[in-house]
């Protein structure tokens, strides 16, 4: 069966300066390949987090991505600013040269409230 990417929340609201968790779970780890978070869609989308060795300030994984039984690819964004507003997508890729996008979550819109 094809892997499904589940983003349970359609939207979240967070006060500027606070932290928020964007939830994403997969139904399978197969096929082999990375999971990445983007803000926006199309050519202009911005890479927010990749479950690899890359380092992303203010963004951390919520659960242990190296754990073999782990299907939770949620992220935490800390010290949220108004510029963080937008729709975030959890995207599953199949490993290759280059990697191929095979499934995306439905997106979670982040609203940033003035503190």
């Amino acid at each position: 069966t094809e892997v499904k990417v589940i983003q349970p929340e359609k939207s979240v609201s967070v006060a500027a300066g606070d932290s928020t968790v964007l939830n994403c779970t997969l139904t399978s780890l197969l096929p082999v390949g990375p999971i990445r978070w983007y803000r926006g869609v199309g050519q202009s989308r911005q890479l927010i987090y990749s479950f690899t060795t890359e380092h992303f300030p203010r963004v951390t994984n919520v659960s242990d991505a190296t754990k073999r039984s782990n299907l939770d690819f949620s992220i935490r964004i800390s010290n949220v600013t108004p510029e963080d507003a937008g729709t975030y997508y959890c995207v599953k890729f199949q490993r290759g040269s280059p990697d191929t996008e095979i499934q995306s979550g439905g997106g979670t819109e982040v609203y940033v409230l003035a503190k």
Epitope: L29, S63, D64, T66, K67, R68, S69, N70
Partner: antibody
Framework: AVTLDESGGGLQTPGGALSLVCKGS????????MNWVRQAPGKGLEWVAG????????YYGAAVQGRATISRDNGQSTVRLQLNNLRAEDTATYYC?????????????????WGHGTEVIVSS | ALTQPASVSANPGETVEITCSGG?????YGWFQQKSPGSAPLTVI????KRPSDIPSRFSGSKSDSTGTLTITRVQAEDEAVYYC??????????FGAGTTLTVLG
Amino acid sequence: AVTLDESGGGLQTPGGALSLVCKGSGFTFSSHAMNWVRQAPGKGLEWVAGISSDGRFTYYGAAVQGRATISRDNGQSTVRLQLNNLRAEDTATYYCTKNGGCGSGGDLDCIDAWGHGTEVIVSS
Amino acid sequence: ALTQPASVSANPGETVEITCSGGGSNNAYGWFQQKSPGSAPLTVIYDNGKRPSDIPSRFSGSKSDSTGTLTITRVQAEDEAVYYCGSADNSGAGVFGAGTTLTVLG
């Protein structure tokens, strides 16, 4: 060569606490998940606890859940197991193990190296 | 716990297979040799089929469906030991098999 040296075993009192330390060398300690495994006299192997390479995530076996704390200091290349409220059934040889570049704490399929072990006897 | 046979036996030079089942759906199997009670185990296979550098090529591992297999070709007397498989269950907890005693006959 990879070496894992455990210390802190010995005779312990029921209800007391113990602290085991494992010192790793010969590999990039901060890149590998670590586990503690024990073996009671005449019994098989039992997983005790595990910790991810960065120390953010910890995992515990059912027999020690709520009594154990695993932690690591990547600067010192050490992993520590604290076990409280000791019972006679905690009597065992405790082994420190290293994961070989895959998996995390609890993923025993990834263990590629073992320490020599430290013996713990819980008795009054 | 993982399921593995209690004992297997083989003559020197023969091939022996030890199976292990019960690991989580996403997990692999590792194989650990213990030559005597109280002596430190030795990893002979990890991550299904990877072999530490000091382990002879006579030891190999594989996984088919949810069953892991340790294969020892050209068995030698020094291979006599208890072999444990290890993995993790679907909750992520580490699990071992009860151990398989390999007896080398003759």
